[in-house]
Amino acid sequence: SKLKGPELSLKGTQHVTQAGQTLHLQCRGEAAHQWSLPETVSKESKRLSITKSACGRNGKQFCSTLTLNAAQANHTGFYSCKYLAVPTSKKKETESAIYIFISDTGRPFVEMYSEIPEIIHMTEGRELIIPCRVTSPNITVTLKKFPLDTLIPDGKRVIWDSRKGFIISNATYKEIGLLTCEATVNGHLYKTNYLTHRQTNTIIDVQISTPRPVKLLRGHTLILNCTATTPLNTRVQMTWSYPDEKNKRASVRRRIDQSNSHANIFYSVLTIDKVQNKDKGLYTCRVRSGPSFKSVNTSVHIYDKAFITVKHRKQQVLETVAGKRSYRLSMKVKAFPSPEVVWLKDGLPATEKSARYLTRGYSLIIKDVTEEDAGNYTILLSIKQSNVFKNLTATLIVNVKPQIYEKAVSSFPDPALYPLGSRQILTCTAYGIPRPTIKWCWRPCNHNHSEARYDFCSNNEESFILDPDSNIGNRIESITQRMAIIEGKNKTASTLVVADSRISGIYSCIASNKVGTVGRNISFYITDVPNGFHVNLEKMPTEGEDLKLSCTVNKFLYRDVTWILLRTVNNRTMHYSISKQKMAITKEHSITLNLTIMNVSLEDSGTYACRARNVYTGEEILQKKEVTIRDQEAPYLLRNLSDHTVAISSSTTLDCHANGAPEPQITWFKNNHKIQQEPGIILGPGSSTLFIERVTEEDEGVYHCKATNQKGSVESSAYLTVQGTSDKSNLE
């Protein structure tokens, strides 16, 4: 028949009893049985007694009574009763268990780790139990990650089980740390602490600290140092393999450095005394941590005696460029042991010559290369203890990018102006290594007569290469080149002679060599205005006349031309704009802005200024003109006409100079008839002079001049007598 499982006197899966009380638990079964108790309950303890007896009907059953006197909190756990000698496959029917809480208000946790935390090993991705089980099922426990984080049970990832503690179903690195279970009982806070610790198999780095390859003379000692770096919670095994391993030629020492707060450093040092040729070959350091593995190799070369070989790396003549931050002059050297290295420049120790020379291995580094670094460089190699010496020389050419000297010394903020029609000489002096070639280019200015934009000369225009026969732009007289020693350097001077300056544009001289190209732009602006800025007053007007001023500026040098009137108000000079550039007339070389003030009055007197802005400097330039409007004044003659006699066929002049404001108009009359200009009769400037060519007797008579303006008129007359009359006259 089927065996019925043992029965416990306390029913259910769990039971709570108070600390200090006696726990009674009886097991009744159909076969001999034994008790399984919490580890903290010692079967030898005087507190514990287990009494066996026959029981049941006819005494056919087996009974066992467990008595635990003065039960303690740490006795909390599973108490189970199971049959002896029953196959494990039927365990369920052969065992009965109950979880008994021994409740102690002074000890909520079964295991207390308050002073020294308990270490729990964890594996990421696996279940992690924080075993802060309690002595009473109704104690509320909080799980904290020291000091600020609380892990809240969610019934899935974090589960609270009063018999086990906190179960974290899928532990991550975030659970690594000091985890504290906290419970408050009767106003007292109790804590039990756990340190979760993750053992890793990470190998961060493996290195052999000696240079690669390792070179030794026969009979010397070989020392190889292998270093493995790992996280703090990793341990490693380090092994070596090497050529004469079978004869155990090497001795190996190991040590660990844990002084770094973030990593462990493991060292394995291999030593072979008095190396032989058989010790040459590959040495491998192998590092293993669980499944992780890393290795590192080095080659060991054994030499019989010291030697040096030295060759040019490329060619014997080397080239570099002035201005280079650093140039490495190096030779191909094979030597052992390492020789002493000295570099000579033109026969003298280089590093003593200049602080810019540094020796690095078999190389000479020249910092901030200059032209003076050109020369012969010799490497001297010596192994003095073995009396081995070698040297080799290389020539260094330092190429220099062309420089144009006029470019460096030019201090003009804005371009020069070249008078229209003038002959001009333009020069560029260039230096470079190799010697640069100089060519001249011409770029005409863009003439833009739209109102929106000023005429300008920009780099956008097409550039033309010039030669003496070029018919582009201005007529060229010649392009010549000569060598000149300036500041001790052989420089090339190129001169362009412009025969007839007519077209504005940009001349460029371009100096080129294999290092590079440099250009100088010469703005060649033609001016038909003296100094590129001229103000003109047609005449000083009188009241009622028109004031006519004109301002002419070079159109490539100036913009924003405006006429302004300067007025002084309370000791301050005020500028009143009276015309703008939009009224200006643009011509080939200049802009003219005319100002006309009609019918002026005395109040129009003042300082008139033409203002323009220099395109290059942005500076505003003023040219002033004082204008004084004169009062109207009736004409008056400076000298009256006087009678005079003139020989026939000769010429004569009559002057009628009058002043007045406005300037009087002069009218001539002869015998009261108005004289018009005709062949033989010429009216001079402003009609103030009457000139009669080849006088005839008809020219005799009363001559009358009249000066008239708005204020009145004045007249004067005189008789002109013609002498040496014709026969007719003589007869009379």
Partner: antibody, heavy 119, light 111 residues
Framework: EVQLLESGGGSVQPGGSLRLSCTAS????????MNWVRQAPGKGLDWVSS?????????YHVDSVKGRFTISRDNSKNTLYLQMNSLRAEDTAIYYC???????????WGQGTTVTVSS | QSVLTQPPSASGTPGQRVTISCSGS????????VNWYQQIPGTAPKLLIY???QRPSGVPDRFSGSKSGTSASLAISGLQSDDEADYYC???????????FGGGTKLTVLG
């Protein structure tokens, strides 16, 4: 290399405000609780505020700054903040930003930023 | 007034052993771990001891910590001139819900 760099200190009048920042580098910022600790001139260390790693559950402040100072963090910028309002003369100190270790206390400290409150 | 109590000063000659005490209450030292910090003048504090007695990597074994009940102590043996600094004890305080520090002990190395 693990580093904390504070900024935002300066001089302010009583009643004024300042915002201190602490930029972290060399470690996974979001995995660690952070703190502000201050040291008045010639005096000892005083804890000011703490914030847990998530920055949305637990923040703690010393009583003397409660209601005036707020600790916060932006894990995306690896930055810890301390917003200080209604500043008083007794708040004058060097303010250190510190990181909590998994097992240790405050294992990394910044170089500090000076806050001066005076009229 | 600091929550944890430390002597304001301590001194010793090179090679000597010096002990600095730190006393608190159940809510801090009694129920939590103690940390010790060293602060060399003009620099930020540095963690010296954690979990009552553990040394971070790089801290010499001349420094040791212990805790008993609501008190803790830091011992420095084989005193050296570069140990001259301010030493602070610290602990979490459950009542204040924050860190508490001792007032600091200025250690002078004589001679």
């Amino acid at each position: 290399e693990v580093q904390l760099l504070e900024s935002g200190g300066g001089s302010v009048q009583p009643g004024g405000s300042l915002r201190l920042s602490c930029t972290a580098s060399g470690f996974n910022f979001e995995d660690y609780g952070m703190n502000w600790v201050r040291q008045a001139p010639g005096k000892g260390l005083d804890w000011v505020s703490s914030i847990n790693r998530q920055g949305d559950i637990s923040t703690y402040h010393v009583d003397s700054v409660k209601g005036r100072f707020t600790i916060s963090r932006d894990n995306s910028k690896n930055t810890l903040y301390l917003q200080m309002n209604s500043l008083r003369a007794e708040d004058t100190a060097i303010y250190y930003c510190t990181k909590n270790h998994d097992y240790h206390g405050m294992d990394v400290w910044g170089q500090g930023t000076t806050v001066t409150v005076s009229s | 007034q600091s929550v944890l109590t430390q002597p304001p000063s301590a001194s010793g000659t090179p090679g000597q052993r010096v002990t600095i005490s730190c006393s608190g209450s159940r809510s801090n030292i009694g129920n939590n771990f103690v940390n010790w910090y060293q602060q060399i003048p003009g620099t930020a504090p540095k963690l010296l001891i954690y979990l009552n007695s553990q040394r971070p990597s790089g801290v010499p074994d001349r420094f040791s910590g212990s805790k008993s009940g609501t008190s803790a102590s830091l011992a420095i043996s084989g005193l050296q001139s570069d140990d001259e600094a301010d030493y602070y004890c610290a602990s979490w305080d459950d009542s204040l819900n924050g860190w508490v520090f001792g007032g600091g002990t200025k250690l002078t190395v004589l001679g």
